[in-house]
């Protein structure tokens, strides 16, 4: 399994002068997908730091795909960046921060956090894996920077969220993540495998996120849920291209590597974004 | 095996309240991995999405914000059906209602048989 | 909201042909889309989720593809059943909205 022929490599901080990126996805490579379409679409260039056209076959591919080039602009340039200044003045909270925590219509069980308006915290809940509301992080520290108050009663982001452009979309956008991994992909990549109420024994494959990797399993026939895929390559395509590695600047990281990866310097921390 | 059976009058008057209810078989309207809804279905509007509740330890709703000031979707545990309350109807919420349920995937996977609802005085 | 728009709005085939119905969101959607089949006097019936997912008991002719914002279903030889009108629904995010339709007609 070549999958497992990974060298290990130091990787350390850059050159580059900070680009500062409102979405993880901007940083990921163009990608024109398995079809045969011509559709002219708009991706970000994490080098030329610029919106620019590529042809896209017409399905899969990521989300650094813009229909036009002022769309691109707006999702992926820095002039555009929603920011919330640090600042002695009181900050507004967003409004999804009053709103109460929302599990959202699926079955996938995701531990999310929310802000509690009660409370003036940011607490732990499950997230069923679509919609819901905006009322959803990652993570408590990206929680607490949007949401909660600082010590004096301030807002304390010096960079805010810029929530997906879809209102109570599948999966709020974060701009910070502290975790080493950060998933960008379909949310059910993260669910369990689910063999499903019926009795027969079909090979399947699912996305085991705790290893990063597809892994076989048998499938009833029916039920079950979304993390399951007819081919090794369908999983590998719809949830590994999800992954972004991160590491925090001027740090050091033993990780593992396959293929080249692009490197570019994002806010205060690196993002190694794999070419799949 | 799932179904739905929907209930509830014809002919509505303006202004007044329009009220559905959906009965339940084969899944519980409590249930933590559906999700029950209403959609109605008109010429001029084609399927329009009107409102969602599930449970998931306790009660939540999103509705259309076309019509968010006037519906109300409740469930009824004891029955095992949920309902539809639209208030101050006029001639343009005609149309035939569905109740539906949404699976864990998200989808509406089992739907009633629709009620035509005409708003008429 | 997110508008979901069908192509064409109607069309004519014969038994055993291939036929292509689209759908186009005004946003991305990623995969969250389901393709419905509504024959006259019925209820809608779930095709397709996950914009390639095929529900349990769904003939495998019918087919669907696509993420981001532009969708295709695919019914690969059609049979005198298959008559009827397709609706596409996003899942994305509230409200959750359908297209606006495509009948399939007997040329």
């Known amino acids: 399994d070549s999958e497992e022929d990974e060298e290990h490599t130091i990787i350390t901080d850059t050159e580059l002068p900070p680009l500062k990126l409102m979405h993880s996805f901007c940083a990921f490579k163009a990608d024109d997908g398995p079809c045969k379409a011509i559709m002219k679409r708009f991706f970000f260039n994490i080098f030329t730091r610029q919106c620019e056209e590529f042809i896209y076959g017409g399905c899969e591919g990521n989300q650094n795909r813009f229909e036009s080039l002022e769309e691109c602009k707006k999702m992926c340039t820095r002039d555009n960046a929603n920011r919330i200044i640090k600042t002695t003045l009181q900050q507004e909270k967003p409004d999804f921060c009053f709103l109460e925590e929302d599990p959202g219509i699926c079955r996938g069980y995701i531990t999310r956090y929310f802000y509690n308006n009660q409370t003036k915290q940011c607490e732990r809940f499950k997230y069923g894996g679509c919609l819901g509301n905006m009322n959803n992080f990652e993570t408590l520290e990206e929680c607490k920077n949007i949401c909660e108050d600082g010590p004096n009663g301030f807002q304390v982001d010096n960079y805010g969220t810029q929530l997906n452009a879809v209102n109570n979309s599948l999966t709020p956008q974060s701009t910070k993540v502290p975790s080493l991994f950060e998933f960008h992909g379909p949310s059910w990549c993260l669910t369990p495998a689910d063999r499903g109420l019926c009795r027969a024994n079909e090979n399947r494959f699912y996305y085991n996120s705790v290893i990063g990797k597809c892994r076989p399993f048998k499938y009833s026939g029916c039920g079950g849920n979304e993390n399951n895929f007819t081919s090794k390559q369908e999983c590998l395509r719809a949830c590994k291209k999800g992954f972004i590695q991160r590491i925090s600047k001027g740090g050091l990281i033993k990780t593992k590597r396959k293929r080249k990866k692009q490197r570019v310097k994002i806010a205060y921390e690196e993002i190694f974004v794999k070419n799949m | 095996q799932v179904q739905l059976q929907q209930s509830g009058p014809g002919l509505v008057k303006p202004s007044q309240t329009l009220s559905l209810t959906c009965a339940i078989s084969g899944d519980s309207v409590s249930s933590n991995s559906a999700a029950w809804g209403w959609i109605r279905q008109s010429p001029g509007r084609g399927l329009e999405w009107l409102g969602i509740i599930y449970y998931r330890s306790k009660w939540y709703n999103h509705y259309a914000v076309s019509v968010k000031s006037r519906i109300t979707i409740n469930p009824d545990t004891s029955k095992n059906q949920f309902s539809l309350q639209l208030n101050s109807v006029t001639p343009e919420d005609t149309a035939v209602y569905y109740c539906?349920?949404?699976?864990?995937?998200?989808?509406?996977?089992?739907w009633g048989q629709g009620t035509l609802v005409t708003v008429s005085s | 909201d997110i508008q979901m728009t069908q192509s064409p709005s109607s069309l004519s085939a014969s038994v055993g042909d291939r036929v292509t119905i689209t759908c186009r969101a005004s946003?991305?959607?990623?995969?969250?889309l389901a393709w419905y089949q509504q024959k006259p006097g019925k209820a809608p019936k779930l095709l397709i989720y996950?914009?390639?997912s095929l529900q349990s008991g769904v003939p495998s002719r019918f087919s669907g593809s696509g993420s981001g914002t532009d969708f295709t279903l695919t019914i690969s030889s059609l049979q005198p059943e298959d008559f009827a009108v397709y609706y596409c629904?996003?899942?994305?995010?509230?409200?959750?909205?359908f297209g606006q339709g495509t009948k399939v007609e007997i040329k």
């Open positions: 996950a914009a390639s």
């Open positions: 629904q996003q899942r994305n995010g509230f409200p959750l909205t």
């Open positions: 539906a349920r949404s699976n864990w995937s998200g989808y509406f996977d089992y």
């Open positions: 946003q991305d959607i990623r995969n969250n």
